[in-house]
Every structure is written in C-alpha cells, then in structure tokens.
Interface confidence: low
C-alpha cells in the first residue's frame, strides 16, 4: 500500500477547521475490516485518531478530530481537525496498514491575521519641526509572529530607532507593538505595515503630521 499526502504544509486559520489530506490506493475487493489507520503526532508519537478492527475508534486528541467514514473505502484517509489552535501546529503522520503498511507526514501551519494597526503619538500636541516624537503601531491577535516595516510619506524605509516587541497571549496569539522615534520634518506621513509571513497578509496603519490637527 502506498500512502500519499500533500507535499506542502496545510495552512489553517485559528478557530477554523483543517483537513490533513492522506490517501491510499485500495486493491479490488478491499474492505474496511482489513484497514488499520492511525494518525499520530510525528514528533511525540501521540495518538490523534485511529480506525481499527473495522470501526472508527474515535479521537484521542482533544475530541476535535474526525475521519471521513464514507470515503475510507475509496482510499481517503484524511483527518479533519476542528477549531484549530496554535498548539495544533506541527507534523502529523498518517499510517495505513492493510496487508503491508506505509506512512507519510503532513505539516500543519497555523495562522491568524493581524488586526488593522492602531497608531498613537507621543507627545500628541504642540508639535513643531525638529521635535522628537514617538509613534507606536499596535496590531493584535496574529500568528505566527509578524514582520513590521516602517516607511515615510515617500515610501522610503525607516529602519533606525525602531523597537518592535511581540508577546503571545494565553492562546498563543501575538500582540505586536512597534515604536518609531523620529525627528519631525515640516510635515510628513509615517506608515507602519504589519505582515503575517505565512498568510502574506499586510495590515497598514499611518499617521500624517501637518501641524494641527493630526490625521490617523
């Protein structure tokens, strides 16, 4: 028996369902009584889900997994993982045994989009050219960790005096805070881009300083 899985990682959004595809080619006359199917975590060998002795043995992993019982006889051994969490990320191995056996591993990459950044300015009044200001760009609840880029109004990257911190909450999602310290020109726009490298999702925020008032 030959097991086939996706070569590419499966990307799943947090709180959505993911399908880890696994298939085999059943011989003519194959019946489910012959099938032993085991899904496990590749690294720890922890059992995730199994089908043995002609029946679905159920989920051994947070009660959030399911097979596709009607499709098993056709060679579809895929696993459905419900309400994906950050901690589900990793490699899963699909073992199929009929007379002989084969296995293959598929990677699950968890992702969550970042929120539109909020921009704050300190100080936020009595601003004059030559003043040093601190602009903070904050974006929330993303995964994995973000890449943060700053640009001025002409699109020129601002790399000096940037400090970015990222902190995971109890769900493993990251809140990103990036601080730019800059000397004000006569007027200017400062843009922050928060990129999720897995989703290739960009979230933009900007602040324009033209004397008073400020535009966010």
């Amino acid at each position: 028996v030959e097991v086939q899985v996706s070569e590419d990682p499966v990307v799943a959004l947090v709180d959505t369902d993911a399908t880890l595809r696994c298939s085999f080619s059943p011989e003519p006359g194959f019946s489910l009584a012959q099938l032993n199917l085991i899904w496990q975590l590749t690294d720890t060998k922890q059992l995730v889900h199994s089908f043995t002795e002609g029946r679905d043995q159920g989920s051994a992993y947070s009660n959030r997994t399911a097979l596709f019982p009607d499709l098993l006889v056709q060679g579809n051994a895929s696993l459905r993982l419900q309400r994906v969490r950050v901690t589900d990320e990793g490699s899963y191995t699909c073992f199929v045994s009929i007379q002989d056996f084969d296995s293959a591993a598929v990677s699950l990459q968890v992702a969550a989009p970042y929120s539109k950044p909020s921009m704050t300015l300190e100080p936020n009044k009595d601003l004059r050219p030559g003043n040093m200001v601190t602009i903070t760009c904050s974006s929330y609840q993303g995964y994995p960790e973000a890449e943060v880029f700053w640009k001025d109004g002409q699109g020129v990257p601002l790399t000096g005096n940037v400090t970015t911190s990222q902190m995971a909450n109890e769900r493993g999602l990251f809140d990103v805070h990036s601080v730019l310290r800059v000397v004000l020109g006569a007027n200017g726009t400062y843009s922050c881009l928060v990129r999720n490298p897995v989703l290739q999702q960009d979230a933009h925020g900007s602040v324009t300083i033209t004397g008073q008032p400020l535009t966010f």
Epitope: E7, P9, T42, D43, V86, T87, E89, G90, A105, Q109, P144, E145, E147, Q166, A168, G172, P197, V198
Partner: antibody, heavy 122, light 108 residues
Framework: EVQLLESGGDLVQPGGSLRLSCAAS????????MSWVRQAPGKGLEWVSG?????????YYADSVKGRFTVSRDNSKNTLYLQMNSLRAEDTAVYYC??????????????WGQGTTVTVSS | EIVLTQSPGTLSLSPGERATLSCRAS??????LAWYQQKPGQAPRLLIY???SRATGIPARFSGSGSGTEFTLTISSLQSEDFAVYYC??????????FGGGTKVEIK
Amino acid sequence: EVQLLESGGDLVQPGGSLRLSCAASGFNFSSYWMSWVRQAPGKGLEWVSGISISYGGNAYYADSVKGRFTVSRDNSKNTLYLQMNSLRAEDTAVYYCGRDRSPYQYRSMDVWGQGTTVTVSS
Amino acid sequence: EIVLTQSPGTLSLSPGERATLSCRASQSIRSDLAWYQQKPGQAPRLLIYGASSRATGIPARFSGSGSGTEFTLTISSLQSEDFAVYYCQQYNNWPPLTFGGGTKVEIK
C-alpha cells in the same frame, strides 16, 4: 550581518555539567527554528537537538542525549542554550548552533556559528 | 531513524574536473534533502536544499538532483576552493534530523 556566536565550551570531567550559549544577531531570532549540531574530532556531523518557535517552544533531541541535554531559548535575549548534564567522553566535540533556512519551518540550516569545543575527560 | 549513506568516502580529482557525489536514504525522503560543504576548522555551509535548490550565494557549478532514496550532488568544474568534505542531511522524518557520513573531495 546575520550571525551566530557560541560560547561556554570547556574541559569538564565525566559526569559533569556545562551550559552552552548561542547569541544571535542580524535577524528576527524568534521567527526561526534553531538546532544544535556537534562534530566529534575527525568525525562527521551529528544533530543533537532542535527547538521550534511554536507556542511553548517544542524541543527535540537525538536519542544519544535524551534525558541528559536540555535545549531552550530566550527570545528577549536572542539567545539559544544547551544545558548538558551527566557528560560522557563521547560527548567530546565541537558544538555548532544553526538557524533554519526559512522562518516557521524546520528543514535545513543556512546560518551556523563558528563552534565551541567541549572536552569531557578526567 | 532514516540512515543516509554517502559514497564514495573519498573522491580524488583535479581542478576543472567534474565531481559526482552520491547520497542514499534508507527509505524514501521525497525531496527533503540538503547538502553542506565543510572545510577544515570551519562551520558547515548550506549548498543545496529541497534536493535541487541552490542556497543564496552558491555558485551555479553546484547542482543537486534526485528524489525518494537516491540523490546526487554535482560540481561541474572543480575550483580550488571546492576541495572540502560534503555532507547530505534529511529533514523528511524527524526527530532526528540525520546527516550522511560525508564525502571528502581531495586534490589528486
């Protein structure tokens, strides 16, 4: 410049302990899987341990060091560690830290430190 | 664990010659293989990943091929700086990540 710099190698007696450090610079350390790889004198490369970026930082070990070595990372300090306990003569080697080629994956290592030498001998 | 067997152990060639290094896996690793170069007293350097993709800054004379269990690293025309030890490494099935025993390319 992307750089890894190991330290902490020393001469230690069998049964002793040592902690190696690997200081990273020039890249977003917290986004990359990291590994420790060693090379005994005149021998080939042997993967020792790896640590993920995932929530909780999953750690992985070669059978030869499991239960004796502990890998950890401090993303706030951009530093990777290897705590080595119950050291044996066969642990004598140059220890390298390596960074995975691309963020969020564990595959091949494109950035290596210069290595730090651990000698276990009485 | 997956065992990688490299051959030959030593390859004696002259500058300008073509070098062909082999790496065999104990079971299929699809294309999940990397090649490294190591010179005496230095850290390894990544040459090839994904069996055939050149790493950043690696000259075109280095090429990788193969999938499943049989892999080849080819250096089309050896330069003086290419004489070194070459290792293959698999990342299809881990832990552990495993390396081959190495092939030394020396000057004839």
